[in-house]
């Protein structure tokens, strides 16, 4: 079940869909899932190179 916005906002500024830490919003199933189920950024050891933007995890996305 999708959670609605917490407050009334303009069409182009809807309220973020809340996901708890370690969850990410799955655009296809339209709810929060464990970030590990999606191909989301993984933390890298210091100095490791990566084809960014796989950097800091932002679960609210």
């Amino acid at each position: 079940m999708r959670r609605g916005p917490r407050s009334l906002r303009g069409r182009d500024a809807p309220a973020p869909t809340p996901c708890v830490p370690a969850e990410c919003f799955d655009l296809l199933v339209r709810h929060c899932v464990a970030c590990g189920l999606l191909r989301t950024p993984r933390p890298k050891p210091a100095g490791a190179s990566s084809p960014a933007p796989r950097t800091a995890l932002q679960p609210q996305e």
Epitope: L27, L37, L38, E61
Partner: antibody, heavy 118, light 113 residues
Framework: EVQLVESGGGLVQPGGSLRLSCAAS????????WNWVRQAPGKGLEWVGN???????YYNPSLKSRFTISRDTSKNTFYLQMNSLRAEDTAVYYC????????????WGQGTLVTVSS | DIQMTQSPSSLSASVGDRVTITCRSS???????????LHWYQQKPGKAPKLLIY???NRFSGVPSRFSGSGSGTDFTLTISSLQPEDFATYYC??????????FGQGTKVEIK
């Protein structure tokens, strides 16, 4: 680094069937969504469909249920089964991985050409 | 389905020119989670597309600073500030906000004048 390699393209007669394969290395197809995107000669890109971490599939409604996406996790490979092929299905078919945070296609295969002709 | 309309369909430009490509969606691409999932890809003949810009204005890794993206809602722009020889290609906008299906613009071919 994730790499995708397609195979299975070729010449097929109208009404025929073909199965394309996309072998993934460097990442598990049990995570994320794995896609097929096609491009007719001289035309733009068209999303065909995908298969997700749970095995769920999503399709472009324009393809009228003629295409089916499946996977074999033991081979880390996913497939596009194409039935009742038509001349307008002639295209280069790309497989692509989807970034699950920003939702763009971040890794692509080299493409495989499917030609539907008698 | 969301329709993505690019303009122009093709353009001729010279090295050093500033090039602007526009993309308009049939409805707002702002998701209920607050993000705008509008991306730009570059494709050269016989090659797979490559990501240039994600989420309207973020350059992908390794993409030169001459590429920039802007816009909001339904109207978006890709700008190449000073066209280089390697930039002659076809550019596509794409949306992931209202999925499925994922949809692309029809493409803009940038040719040498």
């Amino acid at each position: 680094e994730v790499q995708l390699v397609e195979s299975g393209g070729g010449l097929v007669q109208p009404g025929g069937s073909l199965r394309l394969s996309c072998a993934a290395s460097g990442d598990s197809i049990t995570s994320g969504y794995w896609n097929w995107v096609r491009q007719a000669p001289g035309k733009g890109l068209e999303w065909v469909g995908n298969i997700g971490y749970s095995g769920s599939t999503y399709y472009n409604p324009s393809l009228k249920s003629r295409f089916t996406i499946s996977r074999d996790t033991s081979k880390n490979t996913f497939y596009l089964q194409m039935n009742s092929l038509r001349a307008e299905d002639t295209a280069v078919y790309y497989c692509a991985g989807l970034d699950g945070l920003y939702w763009y296609f971040d890794v692509w295969g080299q493409g495989t050409l499917v030609t539907v002709s008698s | 389905d969301i329709q993505m309309t690019q303009s122009p369909s093709s353009l001729s430009a010279s090295v050093g020119d500033r090039v602007t490509i526009t993309c308009r969606s049939s409805q707002s691409l702002v998701h209920s989670n607050g993000n705008t999932y509008l991306h730009w890809y570059q494709q050269k003949p016989g090659k797979a597309p490559k990501l240039l810009i994600y989420k309207v204005s973020n350059r992908f890794s390794g993409v030169p600073s001459r590429f920039s993206g802007s816009g909001s809602g339904t109207d978006f722009t890709l700008t190449i500030s000073s066209l280089q020889p390697e930039d002659f290609a076809t550019y596509y906008c794409s949306q992931s906000t209202h999925v499925p299906p994922f949809t692309f613009g029809q493409g803009t071919k940038v040719e040498i004048k």
